[in-house]
């Protein structure tokens, strides 16, 4: 059985002021069982944008449904994006740890770029 | 507060059909998953079926190609259709809500199902 | 029969310490949890993906892991433990979800 993968297809995307992202990322495996967060930056300091255990995220929607038992998309949508959301995204895979989680497989990133509305 | 009322159990001869239902209420009941659980009399539990919030399904292998599990998330109601029902089938029903990896978290009181002639 | 395996019954003192074990699953696919089953009663989720405790259940009972078996260990039994407690799972090979079946405990 080959190792998971977390696939992120989208080097860049470009998305206006006000307009929703879409950031694509998808898993070769169902296992090791685990849940997908979703941060914007790399390192210590990285930010969590979505959590597929817990929390609430007001402006992210999945683009499929998670519930599904054999769901491999993990994709997103951000919606009413700013020049705040500007950066770059990583989908990444936690395999189940005791007492936390641990950081097991991460996408190449999907750099988000907005395009300011016209004045 | 979450909430989950099994109805629709009762007394079927074998072969027959029943509908059970679940009313769900104090959650938002369109994004969680649900199972079916039952037990029989003096027995362990035995999951019967899953559903998805879109509506993928899942069964155990006891019930597959007699059971179908479906739902109304505008009614916030879960459905167990039972047919082809045999003695075996006898079982105290119970539907649960499902965590984000398909455990369980709620659970409702339960309705007894008797297949008898 | 149970794809899980647990011992059939633990009998403990009350203020003792009860550790009921479960095994049969893949440590790679599978998530555990505990569930209480007092008689004529619905079960009740005491610990869910191996090791988490709900909010409304009290901090005696915990659950830990340790390669492909799983422990529920209740600190300082009380008579109101007494119940049947199951280990359930997810397993995400087969998309099923199995149980094992069952521990009956007695609070001496």
């Known amino acids: 059985e080959e190792e998971l993968q977390v696939i992120q297809p989208d080097k860049s995307v470009l998305v206006a002021a006000g307009e929703t992202a879409t950031l694509r990322c998808t898993a070769t495996s169902l296992i090791p069982v685990g849940p997908i967060q979703w941060f914007r930056g790399a390192g210590p300091g990285r930010e969590l944008i979505y959590n597929q255990k817990e929390g609430h995220f007001p402006r992210v929607t999945t683009v499929s449904d998670l519930t599904k038992r054999n769901n491999m998309d993990f994709s997103i949508r951000i919606g009413n994006i700013t020049p705040a959301d500007a950066g770059t995204y990583y989908c990444v895979k936690f395999r189940k740890g005791s007492p936390d989680d641990v950081e097991f497989k991460s996408g190449a990133g999907t750099e988000l770029s907005v395009r300011a509305k016209p004045s | 507060e979450v909430q989950l009322v099994e109805s629709g159990g009762g007394v079927v001869q074998p072969g027959g059909s029943l509908r059970l239902s679940c009313a769900a209420s104090g959650f938002t009941f369109s994004s969680n998953a649900m199972s079916w659980v039952r037990q029989a009399p003096g027995k362990g539990l035995e999951w019967v079926a899953g559903i998805s919030s879109g509506s993928d399904t899942y069964y155990g292998d006891s019930v597959k190609g007699r059971f179908t599990i479906s739902r109304d998330n505008s009614k916030n109601t879960l459905y167990l259709q039972m047919n082809s029902l045999t003695a075996e089938d006898t079982a105290v029903y119970y539907c649960?809500?499902?965590?984000?990896?398909?455990?369980?978290?709620?659970w409702g009181q339960g309705t007894l199902v008797t297949v008898s002639s | 029969s149970y794809e899980l395996t647990q011992p059939p019954s633990v009998s403990v003192s009350p203020g003792q310490t009860a550790r009921i074990t479960c095994s049969g699953g893949s440590y790679s696919s599978y998530y555990y949890a505990w569930y209480q089953q007092k008689p004529g009663q619905a079960p009740v989720t005491l610990i869910y993906s191996d090791d988490k405790r709900p909010s409304n259940i009290p901090e005696r009972f915990s659950g830990s892991s340790s390669g492909t078996t799983v422990t529920l260990t209740i600190s300082g039994v009380q008579a109101e433990d007494e119940a049947d407690y199951y280990c359930?799972?997810?397993?995400?090979?087969?998309?099923?979800?199995?149980f094992g079946g069952g521990t009956k405990l007695t609070v001496l």
């Open positions: 649960a809500r499902e965590t984000w990896n398909h455990l369980f978290d709620y």
């Open positions: 359930g799972g997810y397993d995400q090979s087969s998309y099923t979800n199995p």
